[in-house]
Amino acid sequence: MAVTACQGLGFVVSLIGIAGIIAATCMDQWSTQDLYNNPVTAVFNYQGLWRSCVRESSGFTECRGYFTLLGLPAMLQAVRALMIVGIVLGAIGLLVSIFALKCIRIGSMEDSAKANMTLTSGIMFIVSGLCAIAGVSVFANMLVTNFWMSTANMYTGMGGMVQTVQTRYTFGAALFVGWVAGGLTLIGGVMMCIACRGLAPEETNYKAVSYHASGHSVAYKPGGFKASTGFGSNTKNKKIYDGGARTEDEVQSYPSKHDYV
């Protein structure tokens, strides 16, 4: 029950996170004009990953796309790439996790297969979240650097007679959306990974069927090398995760924890 809850919650949290990452990537307000300690202008500038916008004091907003690819800063391209990778991984993760959900029955899918898929989607969510956080953080770092550079050169001009006020940009709403969304996706991924551990079938090494011969007991252990992969360590209580491949004998008789030779 707790496993199902953890998995379900992980899925929902990741879903919200990925929706947030998509929203942040599409938002225009990655950087907004800094209004603090700045001459008051009748226009408000803000920029996104794909276009820059100017809002007139009348409320009229005009946005222009970045129609060049080669002319854009490498950092902006990197941020775009990170966000897109995050979205793609997140979307695939969501798709995988839907089939991995314990509450959804798909044919005769084994718990071990679901555990596998849960782990896969969890890792995808973690990487997706990290991509988003990295992308947003790179952009934020770029803004901070540019902010202090433009502050140093706030007023430039010929002999101080004619002054050019540089527009300084500060953190936009999209950065906060991106950070939160990335964090949620990351948390969701961790929850999926935790749920995966609980989904793995609780099997011991001793999946044994006893054959009583006269004189002394011989235990035959089916399952190939799995019974002897302890390399001298105490494997008595180790859970063995076999990817769902079982022999005919095993399908017929599931050994419980109490089946000892």
């Epitope: 202008t41 226009v43 100017v54 007139e56 009348s58 009229f60 002054q163 527009t167």
Partner: antibody, heavy 119, light 113 residues
Framework: QVLLQQPGTELVKPGASVKVSCKAS????????IHWVKQRPGQGLEWIGR????????TYNQNFKGKATLTVDKSSDTAYMQLTSLTSEDSAVYYC????????????WGQGSLVTVSA | DIVMTQSPSSLTVTAGEKVTMSCKSS????????????LTWYQQKPGQPPKLLIY???TRESGVPDRFTGSGSGTDFTLTISTMQAEDLAVYYC?????????FGGGTKLEIK
Amino acid sequence: QVLLQQPGTELVKPGASVKVSCKASAYTFTSYWIHWVKQRPGQGLEWIGRIRPSDSDSTYNQNFKGKATLTVDKSSDTAYMQLTSLTSEDSAVYYCSMGAYYSNSFGYWGQGSLVTVSA
Amino acid sequence: DIVMTQSPSSLTVTAGEKVTMSCKSSQSLLNGGNQKNYLTWYQQKPGQPPKLLIYWASTRESGVPDRFTGSGSGTDFTLTISTMQAEDLAVYYCQNDYFFPYTFGGGTKLEIK
């Protein structure tokens, strides 16, 4: 055709107050800023401030803070500018104008109200 | 406040000639976000309110004859009347509509010779 109607003249005594009106018609009053501009006889233009009729948000020129107060009456599509503690320096033509939507310029102007401060 | 300086303050012209007047601002009126210059030109005839001619330094208002042309960027702007006509006799004002408070130039008065 957008129309901004203003009273022709206002004669007031020094130290008194005057409230100049600007009635808008033929457009959605709440959608555009109303600006007020002062022009002394034979002189240039001076921006006083602006008000957004939808929420009464206003921006003033610091030189007119305390002198001019901008208000609107949405029910009658009318903007008002109250001038207080009048002196001869306040004798001028006061224009109301409608801010353009696409830019920050003033698209339409009223005919102006001549305020004369005289004892 | 931004200071707008217009020159000349008055200009005596003849009908049919090309007229050029200048406007300088104390700070750049160019907005980096959209690469637009927030400078407006108005025409004011005697006894009338000003009339919008050109906005964004070079965009002609609808209904304004194409003999009126605005140009310039940053701090230096020009209004040109390609062929002066009698009805163009007026005072021409430039206005900063980028920084608050909005400020106007002193005006250029066109007079007939």
